[in-house]
């Protein structure tokens, strides 16, 4: 096992150098301090080391720093930070943006989306803050990755990175995460007026509480049914026909096409079948007339 | 992907010299670094010379004897070897390893015999 081999005299290495590419992998694995690596990381990077000789030094590195590497490592990692593991990353403490700023360059096509996401969360976890440059150093990354974060790490993220953020990038949004991100929305685009608005925050309505989706209908926004889709099921259902009416304006008859799919059936389900019949859709599964709906939700009110 | 194909090994007289060759073909335009390693029999694999960019680096047995090189445009490297020695001979294996993938490549080795 190259762990018990005891390092060759005349071969423990006082400075990283080319004499090291010509080590054996047991040699490296006996002979190698990780305190010296992480002092020499820039010599590291610029040598033409194997990849398993990287995948040695890394576990070097991982041995000599279990709590996860210091800032000032990380700082010098440069093209070592291709090998580092998101649940690596997970365990570091990053305060500064520069260094988050050059580590992303180094990732930039690489297909290390997870690792830059973990990076950017880190950092956000330890006070930073997402500006519009990381948002655009994460360059391709989808904006999806706001999904990824914590709830609090969203709280660190400015409201202007939402005017970058498109319709696909909140498909795996957690309910929690939309409510913040619709807030957050909300504030960004807050001197936007008319259509215009309806057109950045729709992509953060799955978001928005029932009240203001009612205050959306008094607009006249003609929401399309897509977005209507992502409305979240405890908003939607608080609306009645004649405020969907007027949200979806001439929309409304792309109902008929979704009325056995959720949210537009939790919707139906709802609603007094009468009304909906006066939408002369031939929507069905409405409560039929005569009957009495019990809210069971506000019984704490009796107790 | 990238395939590597080694040629130009033989039995050679000691004090003499061999170019190997090593094709490389596929996805050429992502190799980071190449080398040539040699393995005698009964021995572990042992890196012989390097090229990265424009930087060369070569192991102690054969500093001053062995050049290597590589030609861009016909997608090869090349590794003089002169004043071959008994203890030169081995199967010679192109290596190359590649950007953003970090992965490595192979040749299947060509054998050099030096005699005596």
């Known amino acids: 096992d190259a762990e018990q081999k005891a390092c060759p005299p005349g071969k423990e290495p006082y400075k990283v150098d080319e004499d090291l590419i010509f080590y054996q992998n047991w040699e490296l694995e006996a002979c190698v301090d990780g305190t010296m690596l992480a002092r020499q990381m820039d010599l590291v990077n610029e040598i033409p080391f194997t990849y398993e000789q990287l995948s040695i030094f890394k576990h070097k590195l991982d041995k000599t720093y279990p709590q996860g590497y210091p800032e000032s490592l990380i700082q010098q990692l440069g093209h070592f930070f291709r090998y580092v593991s998101p649940e690596d990353i997970h365990q570091w403490n990053v305060t500064s943006p520069d260094t988050v700023k050059t580590l992303l360059k180094v990732s930039k096509g690489q297909k290390m989306n997870a690792q830059a996401i973990a990076l950017v969360a880190c950092y956000l976890r330890g006070g930073g803050q997402l500006d519009e440059d990381m948002v655009k150093a994460l360059g391709d990354i989808p904006l999806s990755y706001l999904c990824d974060f914590s709830p609090q790490d969203l709280h660190s993220v400015p409201s202007s990175v939402m005017w970058l953020v498109g319709p696909q990038d909140l498909d795996k949004c957690s309910q929690r995460h939309l409510g913040l991100l619709y807030q957050k929305a909300c504030s960004a685009f807050q001197n936007v007026s008319g259509l215009e608005y309806f057109e950045k925050i729709k992509t953060f309505l799955g978001g928005a509480s029932v009240k203001d989706l009612r205050a959306l209908s008094q607009h006249n926004v003609s929401m399309d049914i897509a977005t209507f889709k992502r409305l979240q099921v405890d908003s939607l259902v608080g609306l009645s026909v004649a405020e969907v009416q007027k949200l979806l304006g001439p929309n409304i008859v792309d109902l008929k096409t979704e009325e056995d799919k959720s949210p537009v059936r939790d919707w139906l389900f709802r609603q007094h079948q009468k009304d909906l019949d006066r939408l002369g859709l031939g929507l069905q599964g409405g409560i039929p007339n005569g009957y009495l709906v019990l809210d069971f939700n506000v019984r704490e009110a009796f107790s | 992907q990238v395939q590597l194909v080694e040629s130009g090994g033989g039995v050679v007289q000691a004090g003499g010299s061999l170019t190997l060759s090593c094709a490389a073909s596929?996805?050429?335009?992502?190799?980071?670094?190449m080398r040539w390693y040699r393995q005698a029999p009964g021995t572990e694999r042992d890196l012989v010379a390097v090229i990265y960019g424009s930087s060369t680096y070569y192991a102690d047995a054969v500093k001053g004897r062995f050049t290597i090189s590589r030609d861009n445009s016909k997608n090869t490297l090349y590794l003089q070897m002169n004043s071959l020695r008994a203890e030169d001979t081995a199967v010679y294996y192109c290596?190359?390893?590649?950007?953003?993938?970090?992965?490595?490549?192979w040749g299947q080795g060509t054998l050099v015999t030096v005699s005596s």
């Open positions: 596929g996805s050429t335009f992502s190799i980071r670094a």
């Open positions: 290596n190359a390893d590649t950007i953003g993938t970090a992965r490595d490549y």
